[in-house]
């Protein structure tokens, strides 16, 4: 289409645009202090403020330091990008026992299953190894995931993991666990990024530039900024993000520079009257009868998750809102029915953790 490839003269006389010969298009000229998010920006929202290397632009439009993965027990999972922090995780052979924003405060070595136990779930960066008793007839010496993959049911004890103190320990002082020490270190060296690519090719901010003056051709970020808790709407106005401060609401998505915070009804409730980016009226889920099935999951979480039965088997027990509006979600897959006795139960949304009480009945974990 002609409008997709305008001639150079169509940009003349328009100081807010310039012609890019490489893409043969008119491009939007970002104001000083900001730079394009793409090769040929088309509108102010294609421009953004720039941060110095190793910083990212957070939702409140502030340059914020990316976390560092420099501790011996951490490796970089995702690099520092212009709009998101670097993310660190425990290095191979370790799992996170105390999480931190975009990182892990304390890593432990994965447990080695003791004699008579086999690996049910291998350890990950987030979870420790899960062990289970070896099936009858299986050799007690069978203690590695390679030799013992036979599924089994029963209790799931875990060996005590070995802690790594981020402040005082280094890789060389870790105790050897089951001969895996060298393998872990080798794997760590392979997966640790030798040099973070996050700052490569990112121009650093010139402190002499004023972010409010018109900027020279090809320079960047021109979009209007809003205060924290405000977003730039389609009309280019700073508009308040909705608030989820009501007791029956929880935040679904955060307030971003170009979109409002969105709220949804808290676990155990359903939206009866919707509102823009939120719910004007939440009502408790109704009591309804249904069969349930238990879904096995990683028992290291020490709880049991329950699933709704297959589609079509669930009775229709949605609340009828006063205004006749359909609830936000009526799909049977949106909620979990908890019923260890196959009696009347309360549906629980998937986001709510469900734990077994000492009586064996599931209880909603308030978290």
């Amino acid at each position: 289409f002609p409008q997709d490839r305008p001639f150079e003269d169509t940009c003349h006389g328009n100081p807010s645009h310039y012609y890019d010969k490489a893409v043969r298009r008119c491009c939007y000229r970002c104001p000083m202090g900001l730079f394009p998010t793409q090769q040929c920006p088309q509108r102010p929202t294609d421009c953004r403020k720039q941060c110095e290397p190793d910083y990212y632009l957070d939702e409140a439009d502030r340059c914020t330091a990316c976390v560092t993965c420099s501790r011996d027990d951490l490796v970089e999972k995702t690099p520092c990008a212009w709009n998101s922090s670097r993310v660190c995780e425990c290095r191979p052979g370790m799992f996170c026992s105390t999480s931190a924003v975009n990182s892990c405060a304390r890593c432990f070595f994965h447990s080695v299953c003791p004699a008579g136990m086999i690996v049910k779930f291998p350890g990950t960066a987030q979870k420790n190894t899960v062990c289970e008793p070896a099936s009858p007839g299986v050799s007690p010496a069978c203690a590695s995931p390679e030799n013992c993959k036979e599924p089994s049911s029963g209790t799931i004890p875990q060996a005590k993991p070995t802690p790594v103190s981020p402040a005082t320990s280094s890789a060389s002082t870790m105790p050897v666990r089951g001969g895996t020490r060298l393998a872990q270190e080798a794997a760590s060296k392979l997966t640790r990024a030798p040099d973070s690519p996050s700052s490569v090719g990112r121009p650093s901010s010139d402190p002499g530039l004023s972010p409010t003056q018109p900027c020279p051709e090809g320079s960047g970020d021109c979009r209007k900024q809003c205060e924290p808790d405000y977003y730039l709407d389609e009309a280019g106005r700073c508009t308040a993000c909705v608030s989820c401060s009501r007791d029956d609401l929880v935040e679904k998505t955060p307030c971003a520079w170009n979109s409002s915070r969105t709220c949804e009804c808290r676990p155990g409730m359903i939206c009866a009257t919707s509102a823009t980016n939120s719910c004007a009226r939440c009502v408790p889920y109704p009591i309804c009868a249904a069969e349930t099935v238990t879904k096995p999951q990683d028992m290291a979480e020490k709880d049991t998750t329950f699933e709704a039965p297959p589609l079509g088997t669930q009775p229709d027990c949605n609340p009828t809102p006063e205004n006749g509006e359909a609830p936000a979600s009526t799909s049977p897959t949106q909620s979990l029915l908890v019923d260890s006795q196959a009696s009347k139960t309360l549906p629980i949304p998937t986001s709510a953790p469900v734990a077994l009480s000492s009586t064996g009945k599931p209880v909603l974990d308030a978290g």
């Epitope: 403020k49 409010t212 808790d229 405000y230 106005r237 700073c238 308040a240 608030s243 401060s245």
Partner: antibody, heavy 121, light 106 residues
Framework: LLHESGAEVAKPGASVKMSCKAS????????MHWIKQRPGQGLEWIGY????????DYNQNFKDKATLTADKSSRTAYMQLSSLTSEDSTVYYC????????????????WGQGTLVTVSA | NIVMTQSPRSMSMSVGERVTLSCKAS??????VSWYQQKPEQSPKLLIY???NRYTGVPDRFTGSGSATDFTLTISSVQAEDLADYHC?????????FGGGTKLEI
Amino acid sequence: LLHESGAEVAKPGASVKMSCKASGYTFTTYWMHWIKQRPGQGLEWIGYINPSTGYTDYNQNFKDKATLTADKSSRTAYMQLSSLTSEDSTVYYCTRRGPSYGNHGAWFPYWGQGTLVTVSA
Amino acid sequence: NIVMTQSPRSMSMSVGERVTLSCKASENVDTYVSWYQQKPEQSPKLLIYGASNRYTGVPDRFTGSGSATDFTLTISSVQAEDLADYHCGQSYRYPPTFGGGTKLEI
């Protein structure tokens, strides 16, 4: 918390620059707002500045009238009014929004004592 | 810009009476409305934020209510020290705008 400079007297067509010194909080955390109040009239928002970056935004009515700046080292925000006329003779306040808990928008619990500008030939 | 209209422009009350001040927005402002009290020769003081949240130290005789376009500030039992101008303001959409004020005389 916010201490504004003293009264200013200026001639028509001249400029004045008033200051607002912040104390008791991290100056760069909160954006500084400026508000005009004419005698017996309502409040009028002029604009704000992000002291951390120097980023400013103005009410369209004040784009050619006010210039906002901030000096992080002295924890002071400034507003310069140019091409003064009798319409500019009034009180100007610097103000700061409260914390975002509960997210109730830009509500202003902290105000300077005001700077009176008098434009007189 | 969103226009905030306050009524009445002024009112005279006796101590102990119930006072109701009105503020209307030209378009939906959700609950992003604040109320300010301004005594003669003083800076405005925040009374209510988020339409109904009483600010720290504000006496409980002051109550805010409303949402969308209609907002009310109520003084349940007016006192002599409540003599002041009262301003409402919205911060839902920039620029923030304020009403013309209501002068309360005791």
